[in-house]
């Protein structure tokens, strides 16, 4: 049932980095509480000005990132996992995906690899989010599962409703946003359309349903005739600046 799933809506203003792009760049559908430390490739970094990309598996992250819980030693189950910068040569690792391209994990250390070892950045597949069969899900965790999709669909820009990984996969006027069963190309919001404004940073979790951001010259503001409504039901719409 819905109770086991995080279902907060979200307007995704900042878009994730392009497929295979560098990690550690701003842009994502999820905020993590400011000041949280995470272990990147070589040192601890603060998340104050960092908008991490949420993930459930390594393949969803860029080629020089891996998916992990932001705090060292956290199990990750039931908590938000994000894409972290890959580990450089001779750094500690637990699996191949933690190591930067050209390296693989051997005996807990990132080592240089020959071409036969896991060239993840060259794999001709993109990983697209979707909700897995419920018998595959960890009990009650409600987290997305992943499925591969051949990258040929990225040679043409996705139309409304087609699956995507990043907004750059979508045609003009569309953004890439979660829609229950996967991430799909949705229309950027027009004037008067309902938008989502989060009450506070870090409140939106891994969404099941996301709205695009408001189009150019528009802002997501509370609808004037809804000022009297209770806090929980106040309606936000895209309005002229």
């Amino acid at each position: 049932t819905l109770n086991s799933v995080l279902i907060n809506s979200n307007a995704i203003k900042n878009l994730p980095p392009p497929l295979g792009g560098a990690g550690g760049q701003p842009g994502s559908a999820v905020s993590v509480a400011p000041g949280v430390l995470y272990e990147g490739g070589n040192k601890y970094q603060t998340l104050d000005n960092y908008q991490p990309y949420p993930c459930a598996e390594d393949e969803e992250c860029g080629s020089d990132e891996y998916c992990s819980s932001p705090s060292r030693g956290a199990a990750g189950v039931g908590g938000v996992q994000i894409c972290l910068a890959c580990r450089k040569r001779r750094k500690r690792c637990m699996r191949h995906a933690m190591c930067c391209p050209g390296n693989y994990c051997k005996n807990g250390i990132c080592m240089p690899s020959d071409h036969s070892h896991f060239p993840r950045g060259e794999i001709e597949e993109s990983i697209i989010e979707n909700l897995g069969n419920d018998h595959n899900a960890a009990a009650g965790d409600g987290y997305p599962r992943r499925t591969t999709l051949t990258s040929k669909i990225y040679h043409t820009k996705g139309q409304e409703g087609s699956v995507c990984l990043r907004s750059s996969d979508c045609a003009a006027g569309l953004c890439c946003a979660r829609h229950f069963w996967s991430k799909i190309c949705k229309p950027v919001l027009k004037e008067g359309q309902v938008c989502t404004k989060h009450k506070r940073k870090g409140s939106h979790g891994l969404e099941i349903f996301q709205r695009c951001y408001c189009g150019e010259g528009l802002a997501c503001r509370i609808q004037k005739d809804h000022h009297q409504a209770s806090n929980s039901s106040r309606l936000h719409t895209c309005q002229r600046h």
Partner: antibody, heavy 116, light 112 residues
Amino acid sequence: QVQLVESGGGLVQPGGSLRLSCAASGFTFSSYWMSWVRQAPGKGLEWVSGISYSGSNTHYADSVKGRFTISRDNSKNTLYLQMNSLRAEDTAVYYCARMGIDLDYWGQGTLVTVSS
Amino acid sequence: DIALTQPASVSGSPGQSITISCTGTSSDVGGFNYVSWYQQHPGKAPKLMIHDGSNRPSGVSNRFSGSKSGNTASLTISGLQAEDEADYYCQSWDVSPITAVFGGGTKLTVLG
């Protein structure tokens, strides 16, 4: 333009089997989830099953779980519904629908009649 | 199980406005904040008219509008026309496992 054409419906006895097909055209079939929705004569719509673009994830209504199997062949742009152990209450028009922004395109449907 | 409840029938004269309601349990329309509306003419396939409560797909007349308040979503048709006579279904999603849930449908009759 987007087109979905169902086939394979017909008269079948209770306990029998039937395989429905849905031929898709006018869009990149492998980029969309697909589903089956049915409508019993004079009744409302009932969602039957859904399948991910790659076919690795499938979901079913409780009423058909264990009896119906949804599948797809992306090389043929075709969606399937294998229906086993059919019952009188499965009599309905079966629609295939594209799961884009919700069920955004539907076929015209194929009638399945389960009767002795 | 989640459930969506619609009136069995509504009617109106040409040019009038009518509203069809769809009331859901808190885990679907209210809590989920997402509902779609479909139009179905007799013997035809359903057609998506509204998604995300109030958004019209391209090609749908702006006489059709959607809104939501609390646990009730509404479809309003203004400037009623004879061709609007059809059955209308609201729909929402349960996501674990993924299941589409439809309201029972509302038959719209255009009088005269």
